[in-house]
């Protein structure tokens, strides 16, 4: 650091004073010199280092009428908000000719009430779940001892005797407030008060109770909620998308979920208006007066297939001699699953019913036995999925074929000699 030489008398007639105060204090250091001729620029040192960006001003006035007379120079260094980094030894420095002069030192010290570097933050925690809170304070003067308070009640007999920087809370069953006091020789500072809100624990064991094509019954086990009873639980269901890849803990799915509320108890809910034979993901959260729990992970579920809700449409049956031509269209009503085929039944007035599995074709030619004199022959068709048969169509009487009527070429299906199985219907 530059040092004043003793060859000439120091020009400084006033040296920086001392400042000791609390953080945030605004203070001013000044030095004064008297020089002959053009006044020099006054620099400020802190702990021997020139302050390049000092908030300083310099005021100078000539004592005489001649510029070569003496000048009074006052340099002022302003400290706007005292911080720990401002503390140290301060001096003024001037270069006069080939010499360097340094004033006597002044000292800036920080001393006051403790200052918080970290304070407890508001947060939410699940009931009976451990968590930590942080508090950190410093002087000077040191040492700084902390005292934690819960709901304004000290958690130790004296400052410094209990937990210090980190408070471990094994769990809460009610919403509580926490603060910490910082004590030093100058007094006490109290931190902000953090509110720790106790929410219900995440529900567990979300599972399916029963499945139907358009509804799922689900149940779960509620988590602890402290002294606050659960008011309701909310269940969300979303259509699964193969490309979406919902996994445990992943972000919310892109579709708008179907949301249902359940009064509790019981911790069970019937989700209706679902699509049959469709994969869904479901999750549940439960709410008390303090707020909602976290959601469970998404659980993949699937509605089962159902039977078709309606019979095949536009059934026509025409007869030409010993052959009968029957065709139909797919049911307009929801299939509730994957269509596996059609069943056809026909019966004469005095003959047993014949039941056939046609597969996925929508037309068939029946080869009637005998001379074709079976009277009042009627045909019924039903669609089926893996879940079973849908409703049968109303019996359609066989009409005689009239010349000129279009007749598609059908694969002949020989009527079996004995019925494949008999079906009690209509």
């Amino acid at each position: 650091a530059p040092r004043g030489t003793q060859a000439e008398e120091s020009p400084f007639v006033g040296n920086p004073g001392n400042i000791t105060g609390a953080r945030g204090l605004t203070g001013t250091l000044r030095c004064q010199l008297q020089v002959q001729g053009e006044p020099p620029e006054v620099h400020w040192l802190r702990d021997g280092q020139i302050l390049e960006l000092a908030d300083s001003t310099q005021t100078q006035v000539p004592l005489g009428e001649d510029e070569q007379d003496d000048w009074i120079v006052v340099s002022q260094l302003r400290i706007t908000s005292l911080q720990l980094s401002d503390t140290g030894q301060y001096q003024c420095l001037v270069f006069l000719g080939h010499q360097t002069f340094v004033s006597q030192p002044g000292y800036v010290g920080l001393e006051g009430l403790p200052y918080f570097l970290e304070e407890p933050e508001d947060r939410t925690v699940a009931a009976n779940t451990p968590f930590n809170l942080s508090c950190q304070a410093q002087g000077p003067p040191e040492p700084v001892d902390l005292l934690w308070l819960q709901d304004a009640v000290p958690l130790a007999t004296a400052p410094g005797h209990g937990p210090q920087r980190s408070l471990h809370v094994p769990g809460l069953n009610k919403t509580s407030s926490f603060s910490c006091e910082a004590h030093n020789a100058k007094g006490v500072t109290t931190s902000r008060t953090a509110t720790i809100t106790v929410l219900p624990q995440q529900p567990r064991n979300l599972h399916l109770v029963s499945r139907q094509p358009t509804e799922l019954e689900v149940a779960w086990t509620p988590g602890l909620s402290g002294i606050y009873p659960l008011t309701h639980c909310t269940l969300q269901a979303v259509l699964s998308d193969d490309g979406m890849g919902i996994q445990a803990g992943e972000p919310d799915p892109p579709e708008e979920p179907l949301t249902s509320q359940a009064s509790v108890p019981p911790h069970q809910l019937r989700l209706g208006s679902l699509h049959p034979h469709t994969p869904y993901h479901i999750r549940v959260a439960c709410t008390s007066s303090q707020g909602p729990s976290s959601w469970t992970h998404w659980l993949p579920v699937e509605t089962p297939e159902g039977v078709p809700l309606g019979p095949p449409e536009n059934i026509s049956a025409t007869r030409n001699g010993s052959q009968a031509f029957v065709h139909w269209q797919e049911p307009r009503a929801p299939l509730q699953g994957t269509l596996l085929g059609y069943r056809l039944a026909y019966q004469g007035q005095d003959t047993p019913e014949v039941l056939m599995d046609i597969g996925l074709r929508q037309e068939v030619t029946l080869e009637l036995q005998g001379d074709g004199s079976v009277s009042n022959l009627t045909v019924c068709v039903a669609a089926y999925t893996a879940a079973g048969d849908g409703p049968w169509s109303l019996p359609v009487p066989l009409e005689a074929w009239r010349p000129g009527q279009a007749q598609p070429v059908h694969q002949l299906v020989k009527e079996p000699s004995t019925p494949a199985f008999s079906w009690p219907w209509w």
């Epitope: 006033g14 004064q32 001003t57 005021t59 009074i72 002022q76």
Partner: nanobody, 115 residues
Framework: QVKLEESGGGLVQAGGSLRLSCTAS????????MGWYRQAPGKQRELVAA???????NYRDSVKGRFTISRDNAKNTVYLQMDSLKPEDTARYHC?????????WGQGTQVTVSS
């Protein structure tokens, strides 16, 4: 804009005393240097006395030991106590305030010392 107003001047016999006051319209604690200047007819203006924020006073050689400058920051006032006045002290006395590159001047008060 800071206004400086001088008072206390007058006619006094040689060897007598006067106390000049300079009151500022704003706080004077921020002014690094406060001074009293004088200007006699047909002469250059000259610094009589100055006082800094460190309460260090400077005087013109011709007034040393006779004049005393002081400042009262609480009253925003600077004083010049003039004792053992001489006829050559006759002049218009002006108050001045300096801070960095700013300076303010008063209109002055007349001091006449008769022999």
């Amino acid at each position: 804009q800071v206004k400086l107003e001088e008072s206390g001047g007058g006619l006094v016999q040689a060897g007598g005393s006067l106390r000049l006051s300079c009151t500022a319209s704003a706080s004077i604690s921020s002014f690094d240097i406060m001074g009293w200047y004088r200007q006699a007819p047909g002469k250059q203006r000259e610094l009589v006395a100055a006082i800094t924020t460190l309460d260090i006073a400077n005087y013109r050689d011709s007034v040393k030991g006779r004049f005393t400058i002081s400042r009262d920051n609480a009253k925003n006032t600077v004083y010049l106590q003039m004792d053992s006045l001489k006829p050559e002290d006759t002049a218009r006395y002006h108050c001045a305030a300096f801070q960095s590159d700013q300076n303010y001047w008063g209109q002055g008060t007349q001091v006449t010392v008769s022999s």
